[in-house]
Interface confidence: low
């Protein structure tokens, strides 16, 4: 029988009048144009939703925008629209909500044509009141604000200024002309590229990259021939013209670009590129595209200092620049990602890893799947994900997978199981042990949300008809109910619910439509009455992640230690509640090969734990690039995983040796580097 | 095992509209496509239209636009194809066929082909006044 | 729409032969392309898929080749069942086109 048809499925007591009792619609007055929400702040209910509607004129466009205020997570909205003077706001620059909890809101409206710059509304109460701001420059982008202080904004200006703010968007100073991109480092460091002759584009290759670190009184450049540059983790990164040709390579620096080394990474010509698809403070995914238009590149992995790189992934799927990657980390459990390989035969095929990119295996067929047409073994096949590349090829799959920190070991996505990715009706599958195994949790496409850190699951059928009926978990997606949460159904268009996962409220936003008009309606459900007690202890129990061997005593050991988490059981129907925190307790592993990515020069064979050296570099010296001088390596073949915690057991030798050579590949060495103050 | 099975023979008249049937077994009905493909006597292959069983979309053949409606009944794992103000020409053998079409990367919309691999045993429209 | 091209018409075989039956299409279908066979009185059977996998419970003296533009379906070993009639079709970019035919007779 279909998931959540079983006999066993045991009914929540009562849930249609305890739903009926918190399910809360506002119908917006106004007519059906575009609307966008943003959560204001942590755990505050605040939501702000802009609706607007555009009247093409003959000659202009005419639009016009209003702006809601809930602070009760959605159930009463406020027509706030008088507090920014009716004005109207440029969706394509959003809200531009403030970090953490600072409570901070920036609202661009549009101008005339005629007028000497932008217009802004700032907020530093949650949306409760707005000041307007006329600016000095028009803006290109949204206001980006610095992560450390939300006082501190940047922004580029329609003639390639780059604006800085100090008092949260009171007072502006243009700081540098001639600005392509600007980003905020740490510590409100400004790192912006720089074109010297015609503009952003004419440079391309030959830009300068600046750095500020007191909000522009003083400037270092820190690179020339400069192609772009990224920011991950802590590592920035560059991506450098070479000097005799149109090739460029990536250099990297831990230092804020004080010192740089160059990546050990295959350069790439004008049509290829390169795409940070994961980073954090150990080390970097890195793609890179192949030459010609495959649609395909290789992941390589960083050591922890981001150059050296070890192949990864072979022909993973990435379109081109900008185009799409299914590329996922799976945040409820630590090391796992899932991706997408173009195969020889042109079908594309999901990939997984558990220990953070060091080996890729395909999913494990659901148990209670049979494999489609595209098995060439009836019984042989694998789950395949569908993610952005599905999406962006109009397949009927309204969502990404989706996973949460707090949701232990739940990863839900849209997939079909065979030997590649089907463009039939895709089903929603669940794992509950971030990815080893899996489950399919609902026929057909359907919208979905984590609510409660686990502890429900909601979903909504994607439909072109209008609907009235969501579907709810408290299980995991086991069991599902149904409840109609509206007479008059209504054509959905989205779930909105907190970012974190930690509310019981969920959001379904739609328009109804008539004769005459349509107009945006929401309907706010609160499922605290579903989840009446809070869990008590009794209701967890012990889980140990990456767990595939229970008698091997190195079961659950990935990237060196192993953990146990406490987790909700499946059969209790209660609150983990705000203020949950996921218990884990870790554990440090003996090193074992496992332990190791395969160091420059060395690749692991498919099935196999041993590094083996590249038949064409066999006999060569192992040469790389750090810090601007050449190094010999001398290795056996592998160096420790970034992050990896690991302590004994194996410790193959590897060594480096200063060949005292200079290798900046034109890049500006440290004492090359000038500085200016303003 | 899997099955296509479609309705019996018809006999119409210029101007008038005929529906085909095409019940599905052996299989899940909604996890494959289901194209509609005709043969006039002594003649070649001609690809109508295809249907997804999911939401019922279908995307027809510009020569067909029109006049021709495909739809199915998840119920009884049916589809239908209904061809409407009928000519001599459209004399012919219809058949369903399952189609699972599969998708690949490189390129626009690009996809790997599985071919139709399943088709029911065609019904004759004759149309003649 | 992708118009595909068969050649040749007719083929006269004897059995235990060779043949060689080829399809062009007029724009690149990558390897988007199925072989069929068909009889008198019978539905079409799919033969090829992917330009040259052969599907279930097809003999392995069929195979196809080709990829882009120029196909070719080989039946290395023509026995009495394999006179035909054969279509490829694309499916590369909607309408999905048949070519127009081979027909493989006794010589």
């Known amino acids: 029988s279909a998931p959540g048809e079983d006999e066993e499925c045991g009914r929540v007591r009562d849930f249609v009048a305890k739903l009926a009792n918190n399910t809360h619609q506002h119908v917006f007055d106004d007519l059906r144009g575009s609307v966008s929400l943003s959560w204001v702040g942590d755990s505050t209910g605040v939501i702000l939703v802009l609706t607007t509607f555009h009247v093409p004129l003959v000659i202009m466009t005419f639009g016009q925008s209003k702006l809601y205020r809930s602070e009760d997570y959605g159930k009463n909205f406020k027509d706030i629209t008088d507090l920014i003077n009716n004005t109207f706001i440029r969706t394509e620059f959003g809200m531009a909500i403030g970090p953490e909890n600072s409570g901070k809101v920036v609202l661009t409206a549009e101008v005339s044509g005629g007028s000497r710059g932008g217009r802004i509304f700032r907020s530093s109460d949650f949306a409760k009141n707005f000041v307007q701001t006329d600016l000095p420059f028009h803006p290109l982008t949204q206001m980006m604000y610095s992560p450390q202080n939300s006082d501190y904004l940047l922004a580029l200006s329609t003639e390639n200024g780059l604006w800085v703010s100090k008092n949260f968007g009171g007072k502006w100073e243009e700081i540098h002309k001639a600005v392509c991109l600007a980003k905020w480092g740490s510590d409100n460091t400004i790192f912006f590229t720089t074109y010297a002759n015609g503009s952003c584009k004419a440079d391309l290759g030959a830009l300068e990259l600046w750095r500020t670190s007191d909000l522009g009184k003083s400037f270092k450049t820190i690179g020339v021939k400069i192609y772009s540059f990224g920011l991950g983790g802590r590592f920035l990164f560059a991506s450098v013209m070479a000097d005799k040709d149109t090739t460029r390579r990536i250099h990297v620096s831990t230092d804020q670009g004080d010192t740089w080394s160059m990546a050990q990474l295959p350069s790439v010509g004008q049509e290829q590129f390169y795409s940070i698809l994961a980073a954090n403070d150990d080390m970097v995914f890195m793609h890179v595209d192949e030459p010609g238009d495959t649609g395909f590149g290789t992941i390589f992995t960083s050591d922890d200092r981001g150059i050296v790189y070890s192949k990864s992934l072979d022909r993973h799927l990435y379109t081109t620049t900008g185009g799409e990657t299914d590329f996922t980390n799976v945040t409820s459990l630590r090391g796992v990602y899932i991706t997408s390989v173009l195969s020889e035969d042109n079908s594309i095929q999901t990939m997984i890893t558990f220990d953070q990119g060091g080996r890729w295996t395909h999913l494990r067929k659901p148990e209670n799947s049979e494999c489609d047409a595209t098995a060439k073994n009836k019984n042989e096949c694998s789950l395949h994900i569908h993610a952005s590349y599905s999406i962006s090829q109009k397949l009927n799959v309204p969502m990404a997978p989706l996973s949460e920190p707090n949701a232990v070991g739940i990863v839900i996505a849209h997939g079909s199981v065979g030997d590649a990715i089907s463009v039939m009706v895709p089903d929603v599958y669940i794992s509950d042990d971030g990815g080893y195994s899996w489950t399919k949790m609902l026929e057909g496409p359907h919208y979905y949300t984590i609510l409660d850190s686990g502890g429900i699951i909601v979903a909504i059928e994607h439909s072109s008809r209008p609907i009235n009926v969501i579907k709810f978990s408290t299980d995991e997606g086991q069991c599902w109910q149904t409840y109609t949460f509206t007479r008059d159904p209504i054509y959905f268009t989205g779930l909105a619910s907190e970012p974190g996962a930690r509310s019981m409220n969920i959001s379904i936003w739609g328009f109804t439509e008539s004769f005459l008009t349509s107009q945006w309606v929401s309907y706010t459900i609160d499922f605290k009455d579903i989840l009446e007690r809070n869990c008590e202890e009794k209701d967890y129990t012990i889980w140990l992640a990456h767990s595939t061997d229970p008698e091997d005593y190195e079961d659950g050991c990935i990237l060196g230690y192993k953990e146990q988490f406490l987790r909700l059981r499946k059969s209790s129907v209660c609150q983990n509640g705000r203020d949950y925190v996921v218990t884990k307790q870790p554990s440090i592993c003996l090193c074992s090969l496992e332990d190791f990515l395969c160091d420059f020069g060395y690749y692991r064979p498919e099935n196999d734990s041993k590094c083996v050296e590249q038949p064409e570099l066999k006999g060569h010296d192992l040469e790389f690039c750090l810090y601007g001088r050449e190094e010999h390596l001398t290795t056996n073949g592998y160096r420790k995983i970034p992050g990896d915690k690991c302590q004994g057991g194996v410790n193959p030798v590897r060594e480096v040796k200063d060949l005292k050579k200079k290798c900046t590949s034109n890049f500006l060495s440290p004492e090359k580097q000038n500085s200016k103050s303003n | 095992q899997v099955q296509l099975v479609q309705s019996g023979a018809e006999v119409k008249k210029p101007g008038a509209s005929v529906k085909v049937s095409c019940k599905a077994s052996g299989y899940t009905f909604t996890s494959r496509y289901m194209s509609w493909v005709r043969q006039a006597p002594g003649q070649g292959l001609e690809w109508m239209g295809i249907?997804?069983?999911?939401?019922?979309?279908?995307s027809y053949a510009r020569k067909f636009q029109g006049r021709v409606t495909m739809t199915r009944d998840t119920s009884t794992s049916t589809v239908y194809m209904e061809l409407s103000s009928l000519r001599s020409e459209d004399t012919a053998v219809y058949y369903c066929?399952?189609?699972?079409?599969?998708?690949?990367?490189?390129?626009?919309?690009?996809?790997?082909?599985?071919?139709?691999?399943?088709w029911g045993q065609g019904t004759t429209v004759t149309v003649s006044s | 729409e992708i118009v595909m091209t068969q050649s040749p018409a007719t083929l006269s075989v004897s059995p235990g032969e060779r043949a060689t039956l080829s399809c062009r299409a007029s724009q690149s279908v990558s390897s988007n392309l199925a072989w069929y066979q068909q009889k008198p009185g019978q539905a079409p059977r799919l033969l090829i898929y992917?330009?040259?996998t052969r599907a279930t419970g097809i003999p392995a003296r069929f195979s196809g080749s080709g990829s882009g533009t120029e196909f070719t379906l080989t039946i290395s070993s023509l026995q009495s069942e394999d006179f035909a009639v054969y279509y490829c079709?694309?499916?590369?970019?909607?309408?999905?086109?048949f070519g127009g035919g081979t027909k493989v007779e006794i010589k």
């Open positions: 079709q694309q499916a590369r970019l909607g309408p999905w086109t």
């Open positions: 992917g330009a040259s």
């Open positions: 249907i997804n069983p999911v939401g019922g979309s279908a």
């Open positions: 066929a399952r189609d699972p079409s599969g998708i690949a990367a490189a390129g626009p919309a690009s996809r790997y082909y599985y071919g139709m691999d399943v």
